[in-house]
Amino acid sequence: LVPHLGDREKRDSVCPQGKYIHPQNNSICCTKCHKGTYLYNDCPGPGQDTDCRECESGSFTASENHLRHCLSCSKCRKEMGQVEISSCTVDRDTVCGCRKNQYRHYWSENLFQCFNCSLCLNGTVHLSCQEKQNTVCTCHAGFFLRENECVSCSNCKKSLECTKLCLPQIENVKGTEDSGTT
């Protein structure tokens, strides 16, 4: 089975790498524009230069292309706690990230929010906090993990999942009470 190619991919595949087929004349292959530039005018003929212009401030192209417009630079989303790691240049989009001791949680492919790394109070660090993952905590005896915090088993209600984790503790307490002096 031959995979279906879009019109642009079909046109590009006729020309050697780094070139694209002229939209009005499919016998001409024009040189693609370098990153940081965009297509202003197609090449007039074979072996002639493509008219590429540099992206204006606030826009970029990150790879060779034949785009009629540069792409708009991304903005870091303050409401999501994002900070700018590096600003946009003509050939690279803005890079956004999180502050120190924070991690990224991706709500979708192109949206992340910064959250504070868990400190594992009443527990120990099983896996350290990473760029895209919170600390993994292991709780001390008598505590259970809820929303990545170690919470006392005294806050465990019967209906919650914690009953399995806190049950040995509860049984130990009962056992101590039952073994009274005779």
């Epitope: 903005k75 989303r77 409401e79 999501m80 949680h105 929010q113 959250f115 929303e147």
Partner: nanobody, 119 residues
Framework: EVQLLESGGGLVQPGGSLRLSCAAS????????MVWVRQAPGKGLEWVSH????????FYADSVKGRFTISRDNSKNTLYLQMNSLRAEDTAVYHC????????????WGQGTLVTVSS
Amino acid sequence: EVQLLESGGGLVQPGGSLRLSCAASGFTFAHETMVWVRQAPGKGLEWVSHIPPDGQDPFYADSVKGRFTISRDNSKNTLYLQMNSLRAEDTAVYHCALLPKRGPWFDYWGQGTLVTVSS
């Protein structure tokens, strides 16, 4: 006590429009980023859109960009979602929520309103 109450859902034909509302109380609405999420039958939660407190530069998921518009009226403590050019795949329960602060879960979100897109 934080309360979020959605309304405006219903049955609509493909290509049709709906406007969802979310009435908020129990917190300072004008200080909070508000979110619309949806859950299609048998699927997980999907982030649809969010809007910062000042209403500037809202975010839209690629799946709704150009069709949905989020807005807010801070004087009425109300969040809106205008949904145009609706498709069958937009069928879901739509919830409004406060942007999470402590971790990647929703502490405060509404019961939701069902949107069904079908001919």
